[in-house]
């Protein structure tokens, strides 16, 4: 469990031409408030999909009245943080929507009127317990500056808030493999249910008492790095210094290759590389001429007219060895870049790229917004394996160049009227309703139908809701 915290720094006109008109006037003074909606993962979800990680409303900001003739300044903001509690693990990747709302305070019949000024969205990676992350987002001509972080609520700790804390058993230190629970240094991480001593960095468990290792680590406690060089050849010169816990006697122990053949291990057995004039599984066959057809896989035999002179096999592409007996492991040259997985299909090489990379050899980094323009106030967002434009409302398409009619789907509930606006749609709600889509009923005294106010919030102020 933990809390996602959002701090709004400023909301005002963005840079460039076309400064927006102030949302408030002498005739219609207003104040701002904000709503944040969080969803797990990096999915491109519709704004209307549920805020599965949670949502929150800010308090209302100070009342603001436009000074005649003055350009719209940064608008006065509500005090405090927006806090979105999450009950389960922090997912690490999340999508957010931050809405700026205007509350008009004129003589409205039925109480104040709410309307959406701007909405920004994005997808981010964030570890719980880390520092504040700063961000700037634009919606039409407006610019929103904010910071956010995720922090764990005691007794949870860790980057996903999945580990637990407990009071120290000993006054000076924590137990085996357990760290102090920052910032609660007088508490310690609770013992994991994994196997005793299992590395919390490189081991994990899905059942009590087990210790399963992350890739690259081995041993009962996952404390030994796997070194592929020594693990492939445990008797080689490097094995004494790598610490690799390799299996027992290897298939090459005692060198099964005859006649000076050299042995190399394969995943299931061994393979002999034979000197010229010998072949067979263990290089045991000798006295070969081209008449014996020693070249495999379509290799061309040259020379070797009598048993005393060596023959040479000219191998076709994809094969090697003195008898063209070995398929070339083209993946051993590590042709796939950026951590791509190499697949040798025989007729061709394929690279299966990690998210964020593309190209025949995974050479193109997709997670790079440089030089990528999103039109109409859209924001380029990295992640999910490609660049994407997060478009301002009212625009769509790959580069946010397509104009949408946001009102076509009749999005305003409870009789709200829909207006196409420079920043997307705006719902003018019927008296008694509020929200981006007029979805929230409002009590007659102006308080929303939300949970009771927590300490520090006056009744009638918007609250968090989930």
């Amino acid at each position: 469990a933990g809390v996602f915290e959002l701090q709004i720094h400023s909301f005002g006109p963005g840079p460039g031409p076309g400064a927006p008109r102030s949302p408030c006037s002498a005739r219609l003074p207003c104040r701002l408030f904000f709503r944040v909606c969080l969803k797990p993962g990096l999915s491109e979800e519709a704004a209307e999909s549920p805020c599965a990680l949670g949502a929150a409303l800010s308090a209302r900001g100070p009342v603001y009245t436009e000074q005649p003739g003055a350009p719209a300044p940064d608008l006065p903001l509500p005090d405090g943080l927006l806090q979105v509690p999450f009950r389960d693990a922090w997912p690490g990747t999340f999508s957010f929507i931050i809405e700026t709302w205007r509350e008009e305070l004129g003589d409205q019949i039925g109480g104040p009127a709410w309307s959406l000024l701007a909405r920004v969205a994005g997808r981010r990676r964030l570890a719980a317990g880390g520092p504040w992350a700063r961000d700037i987002q634009r919606a039409g001509a407006w610019e929103l500056r904010f910071s956010y972080r995720a922090r764990c609520e005691p007794p949870a700790v860790g980057t996903a808030c999945t580990r637990l804390c407990r009071p120290r058993s000993a006054p000076s230190r924590c137990g085996p493999g357990l760290r102090p629970c920052a910032p609660l240094e007088d508490e310690c991480e609770a013992p994991l249910v994994c196997r005793a001593g299992c590395s919390p960095e490189h081991g994990f468990c899905e059942q009590p008492g087990e210790c399963r290792c992350l890739e690259g680590w081995t041993g009962p406690l996952c404390t030994v790095p796997v070194s592929t060089s020594s693990c492939l050849s445990p008797r080689g010169p490097s094995s004494a210094t790598t610490g690799c816990l390799v299996p027992g006697p290897g298939p090459c122990d005692g060198n099964p290759c005859a006649n000076g053949g050299s042995c190399s291990e394969t995943p299931r057995s061994f393979e002999c590389t034979c000197p010229r004039g010998f072949y067979g599984l263990r290089c045991e066959v000798s006295g070969v001429t081209c008449a014996d057809g020693p070249c495999f896989n379509g290799g061309l035999c040259v020379g070797g007219a009598d048993p005393d002179s060596a023959y040479i096999c000219h191998c076709p592409p994809g094969f090697q060895g003195s008898n063209c007996e070995k398929r070339v492991d083209r993946c051993s040259l590590q042709p796939c870049r950026n951590g791509g997985l190499c697949l040798d299909l025989g007729h061709a090489l394929r690279c299966r790229c990690r998210a964020g990379f593309a190209g025949p050899r995974c050479e193109h980094d997709l997670d790079d917004c440089a030089g990528r323009a999103c039109a109409n106030g859209g924001t380029c967002v990295e992640g999910g394996g490609a660049h994407r434009c997060s478009c301002a409302l009212g625009f769509g398409g790959r580069d946010c160049r397509e104009r949408a009619d946001p009102c076509a789907a009749r999005p305003c509930a409870h009789g709200g009227r829909c207006y196409a606006h420079f920043s997307g749609l705006v719902c003018a709600c019927a008296p008694g309703y509020m929200g981006a889509r007029c979805e929230f009923p409002v009590h007659p005294d102006g308080a929303s139908a939300l949970p009771a106010a927590p300490p520090g919030l006056r009744p009638g102020d918007p609250q968090r809701y989930l």
Epitope: G177, G197, G219, T223, A240, T241, G243
Partner: antibody, heavy 114, light 112 residues
Framework: QVQLRESGPGLVKPSETLSLTCTVS????????WGWIRQPPGKGLEWIGY???????SYNPSLESRVTFSADTSKNQFSLKLSSVTAADTAVYYC????????WGRGTLVTVSS | EVVMTQSPLSLPVTLGQPASVSCRSS???????????LIWFQQRPGQSPRRLLY???TRDSGVPDRFSGSGSGTDFTLKISRVEAEDVGIYYC?????????FGQGTKLEIK
């Protein structure tokens, strides 16, 4: 080739804290876990515990209330502190690569005496 | 914790003759991945321990092939096929299957 070298005072007074440092050369502290083992004079070996460069540690329960490990990646060193020592803590202290125990330091004798 | 018991504690051997050290554990050292995490060390006089065998029977590079390891479950043996003068020292078994790791008390090999 990986080499380990222990260093620290050879004499510690009873009830004080024993402090030793192990310097790793030929490998990065970040590549492995690292451990401490001790051997009282004329006796057998006892595993004290391990540390990873991030600070993750595991201690032998028989010593855990008195032991603290730390790591300094900038110096490629890791350290052992053993508090409230008695004569029973007199031993040769070795550092080693944890889990595999394939590389050991030469050891340093620490005597606890007033 | 797992108790490791070695025998004999002292082993006088004639040069060129075989030698055998036994190590017994109070719990099975067979781990769920199919490996037996038992290590054998040699400690020559005045030196640090040196790993000879790991995972029961895998010999370290540079270790003569006269050293071999065998056993399963809770009973293990280190064999030296022909003892040489340089083999004098104390031999320890160590289990790293269970936490905390534990050593045998050592077997002192000396030349008769």
């Amino acid at each position: 080739q990986v080499q380990l070298r222990e260093s620290g005072p050879g004499l510690v007074k009873p009830s004080e804290t024993l402090s030793l440092t192990c310097t790793v050369s030929g490998d990065s502290l970040k590549n492995s876990y690292w451990g401490w083992i001790r051997q009282p004079p004329g006796k057998g070996l006892e595993w004290i515990g391990y540390i990873y460069y991030s600070g993750t540690s595991s201690y032998n329960p028989s010593l855990e209330s008195r032991v603290t490990f730390s790591a300094d990646t900038s110096k490629n060193q890791f350290s052992l502190k053993l508090s409230s020592v008695t004569a029973a803590d007199t031993a040769v202290y070795y550092c080693s690569r944890e889990g595999s125990f394939d590389v050991w330091g030469r050891g340093t004798l620490v005597t606890v005496s007033s | 914790e797992v108790v490791m018991t070695q025998s004999p504690l002292s082993l006088p051997v004639t040069l060129g003759q075989p030698a055998s050290v036994s190590c017994r554990s109070s719990q099975s050292l067979l781990y769920s991945d199919g490996n037996t995490y038992l290590i054998w060390f040699q400690q020559r006089p005045g030196q640090s321990p040196r790993r000879l065998l790991y995972k029961l029977s895998t010999r370290d590079s540079g270790v003569p092939d006269r050293f071999s390891g065998s056993g399963s479950g809770t009973d293990f043996t280190l064999k030296i096929s022909r003892v040489e003068a340089e083999d004098v020292g104390i031999y320890y078994c160590m289990q790293v299957t269970h936490w905390p790791y534990t050593f045998g008390q050592g077997t002192k090999l000396e030349i008769k």
